[in-house]
Interface confidence: low
């Protein structure tokens, strides 16, 4: 049976969904086990021009000291203003001084990146030492790549389409993930979903996504249910700032209680079956329905409360 | 809501000075990153200049045709943005609108008028 | 630097017809935007990142496009839309405009 709810964008005011995700277009992670420098490259496309970006860097620690050194290959198509954290590391930083302007001097070896075209700039990487890793990422807010962490079978690091860089690189893109919302027809009341749809990753190792939900309103306004929706292999981590009611695939905890796994259900894995379930637990109002490439974690903040739905 | 009202223009002579200003209000002004943009009349807009945020340690960018003739400044405490014109040519005449960039130009000011003829 | 060349020029066209509007970029680029700007008034955004309306734009409005094909149409012309609507990109230094489409009453 066909659900009727005409899913239209939501105002951001009234619902909006940022993620972490360790997706990329391109990408690849390598292994460099005997490497004396530790090499990374980055292709930032950055749509819009001018941007800001957030990007950290983090070591596991070997025997208490770093591994070895880092060279950071930063290749950057527009204007970016650049928050570098990466305390402690030995990091050499090749970029192009035209594009890259730093919040507070970097601290770090610089070296000027030679204009290149994406094939040569890998080649000229791989020069310096074998790659760790290589990511192609469109408008990133923030990135934090793992230092030490590659866990790539990959001898030799080839950029491929759609890739997991798992724990090495994730990133947190600019823009908001598309919130959607409608009206279930014929369902009385005020009571409303939220529903979020993660899509199947690149690699199918276990995950747990943690989904922070916050609803702006009075905890008495609200009656909701929370359709969480992904891959056999995801599980979930909800960290909600109020009581509603839970509807997964997979198993469930709250961030209060983590070690209590709750099992969760088989869902349709479709945007109409999920609006299907929706309605069939008593929803009036689909406050928000998102769906999103595989995710380390998702925040959701909403003000529906039950009241009247705004689509933008 | 965000206002942007562009004052200072007026007639000057071919080698001349004027400087714009821009008053804002309506949002966090020290946080945006603010544009000239100007228009000959009955002609397309061009860019001309941009100033960024304090974030951004108020970094500046000019078109090739005006770099090193006109200058971009801010005053965050004022909320006002300026834009000094020096040796000033006929070919500067236009409408120059200050704009607020944030992924694209969202806020426009109504322009003020800039003649340069003798 | 990307050029941006809009056509047509001029689009005369009446109430409730269709008006396709193209901006081709001499280079690909990753996004445009669109403002719309009327005689006496400043510009106004109308469409940001190839695809979304500003806001306040009615659904009429729509744009698409990609690399260095770029189009804004508007499904059925309402009296208020015959104005100048001009492009823009900042994929690539400078920012650059289109010489703009005016979209007039036939």
């Known amino acids: 049976e066909t659900v009727h709810c005409d899913l239209q964008p939501v105002g951001p005011e009234r619902g909006e969904v940022t993620y972490t995700t360790s997706q990329v277009s391109k990408g690849c992670v390598a292994q460099a086990p005997n490497a004396i420098l530790e090499v990374h490259v980055l292709f930032l496309e950055f749509p819009t021009g001018p941007s800001q970006l957030e990007l950290t860097l983090q070591a596991s620690k070997q025997n208490g000291t770093w591994p070895r050194e880092v060279l950071l290959v930063l290749s950057v198509n527009s204007s970016v203003f650049l928050h570098l954290q990466a305390l402690g590391i030995p990091l050499h930083l090749a970029y192009n001084s035209s594009l890259v302007t730093f919040q507070e001097p970097p601290g770090v070896n610089t070296t000027e990146l030679p204009s290149f075209p994406k094939t040569q700039i890998l080649e000229w990487a791989a020069e310096r030492g074998p790659i760790t890793s290589a990511a192609e990422l469109n408008d990133p807010q923030s990135i934090l790549l793992r230092l030490g962490q590659a866990q790539g079978s990959l001898s030799f690091c080839m950029l491929e389409a759609s890739q997991d860089m798992g724990r090495t690189l994730e990133w947190r893109p600019r823009t908001p993930a598309l919130v959607r919302g409608c009206h279930l027809e014929g369902v009385a009341g005020h009571k409303e979903a939220h529903i979020l749809r993660v899509l199947p990753g690149h690699s199918a190792g276990p995950r747990t996504v943690t989904v922070k939900v916050e609803l702006s309103c009075a905890p008495g306004d609200l009656d909701a249910v929370l359709i969480l929706q992904g891959p056999p292999y995801v599980s979930w981590l909800i960290d909600a700032n109020h009581n509603m009611q839970i509807w997964t695939t997979g198993e469930y905890s709250f961030k209060i209680f983590p070690e209590k796994n709750i099992r969760g259900f088989k869902l349709p894995d479709t945007p109409q079956g999920l609006l299907g379930e929706a309605r069939m637990l008593n929803a009036s109002i689909v406050a928000s329905f998102v769906e999103l490439p595989l995710a380390s974690i998702v925040s959701l903040h909403a003000s529906s409360c039950g009241g009247r739905l705004q689509t933008s | 809501e965000v206002q942007l009202v562009e004052s200072g223009g007026g007639l000057v002579q071919p080698g001349g000075s004027l400087k714009l200003s821009c008053a804002a209000s309506g949002f966090t002004f020290s946080d945006a990153w603010m544009d000239w943009v100007r228009q000959a009349s009955g002609k397309g807009l061009e860019w001309v200049a941009e100033i960024r945020s304090k974030a951004s340690n108020h970094a500046t960018y000019y078109a090739e045709s005006v770099k090193g003739r006109f200058t971009i400044s801010r005053d965050d405490s004022k909320n006002t943005v300026y834009l000094q014109m020096n040796s000033l040519k006929t070919e500067d005449t236009a409408v120059y609108y200050c704009?607020?960039?944030?992924?694209?130009?969202?806020?426009w000011g109504q322009g003020t008028l800039v003649t340069v003829s003798s | 630097e990307i050029v941006l060349t809009q056509s047509p020029a001029t689009l005369s066209l009446s109430p409730g017809e269709r008006a396709t509007l193209s901006c081709r970029a001499s280079?690909?680029?990753?996004?445009m935007h669109w403002y719309q700007q009327k005689p006496g008034q400043a510009p106004r955004p109308w469409i940001y990142?190839?695809?979304n309306l500003a806001s306040g734009i009615p659904a009429r409005f729509s744009g698409s496009g990609s690399g260095t094909d770029y189009t804004l149409t508007i499904s059925s012309l309402e009296p208020e839309d015959f104005a100048v609507y001009y492009c823009?990109?900042?994929?690539?230094?400078?920012?650059?405009f289109g010489g703009g489409t005016k979209v007039e009453i036939k």
């Open positions: 704009t607020r960039w944030r992924r694209f130009f969202d806020s």
């Open positions: 990142a190839t695809s």
């Open positions: 280079s690909s680029v990753s996004y």
């Open positions: 823009q990109q900042w994929s690539s230094n400078p920012l650059t």
